[in-house]
């Protein structure tokens, strides 16, 4: 039985050229944690093994940075980053969990401007 | 702008099931569909995604009692409900769930009563 929780950064803002830390903690549970794979939409950013250590994807190694910890930090951000992002848990007992992130990456002078958006 | 009208809602009793459609003004070929929800006094929340090579992703407290699946050729995407729970009592709203969004649908009301 899946007693354990995802916490996520939420729906998050950043601006054009910058970088963001997408993280995600899994809580509520003893399960041990197997593995934990990052996901932009239906493409794999990174995968997180707990015996053979990170993985990031030729198409995004120029950009993305593993951790702090089990997180992922994307660089150089362009405008074509926004969308949603998803940690998927691989645990044992418990099997998979989920936690979704939106990042909206936003033109500097929009970003200096205070802007906000709405879920998702 | 793809305008998203949601239906299929309604009352239904612990247990059941419902399917609910999101129609598109156009073609939803290539964007990531989804679907959230919104219970009363709480905010609106992910519930599912769907991709054009039918990548899906559902949330922890959906997952293997929904199932999100989209027609291409009908520009609809669906949400399958089963085993409906009174805690999944909310209105449903379908969207692109890779745009930031300022306006909602009307979305469709489903009531689960114990």
């Known amino acids: 039985m899946m007693t354990g929780t995802i916490e996520t950064t939420g729906n998050i803002s950043a601006e054009k050229g910058g970088s963001i830390i997408l993280q995600c903690h899994l809580s509520s549970t003893t399960a041990q944690v197997t593995q934990v794979n990052w996901e932009q939409q239906d493409q794999l950013l990174a995968i997180c093994n707990a015996d053979l250590g990170w993985h990031i994807s030729p198409s995004f190694k120029d950009r993305v940075a593993p951790g702090p910890g089990l997180g992922l930090t994307l660089q150089s951000l362009t405008v074509n980053d926004t969308g949603e992002y998803f940690c998927i848990y691989h645990t044992y007992p418990d099997g998979t969990y989920t936690g979704r992130i939106f990042l909206e990456v936003l033109e500097s002078s929009v970003a200096e401007h205070g802007a906000r958006f709405q879920i998702p | 702008e793809v305008q998203l009208v949601e239906s299929g809602g309604g009352l239904v009793q612990a247990g059941g099931s419902l399917r609910l459609s999101c129609a598109a003004s156009g073609s939803i070929f290539n964007i990531g569909m989804g679907w959230f929800r919104q219970a009363p006094g709480k905010e609106r929340e992910w519930v599912s995604s769907?991709?054009?090579?039918?990548?899906?992703y559902y949330a922890d407290s959906v997952k293997g009692r929904f199932t999100i699946s989209a027609d291409n050729a009908k520009n609809t995407v669906y949400l399958q409900m089963n085993s409906l729970k009174p805690e999944d009592t909310a209105v449903y709203y379908c969207a692109n769930s890779n745009k930031p969004k300022f306006d909602w649908g009307q979305g469709t009301q489903v009531t689960v009563s114990s």
């Open positions: 769907i991709y054009s090579n039918g990548h899906t």
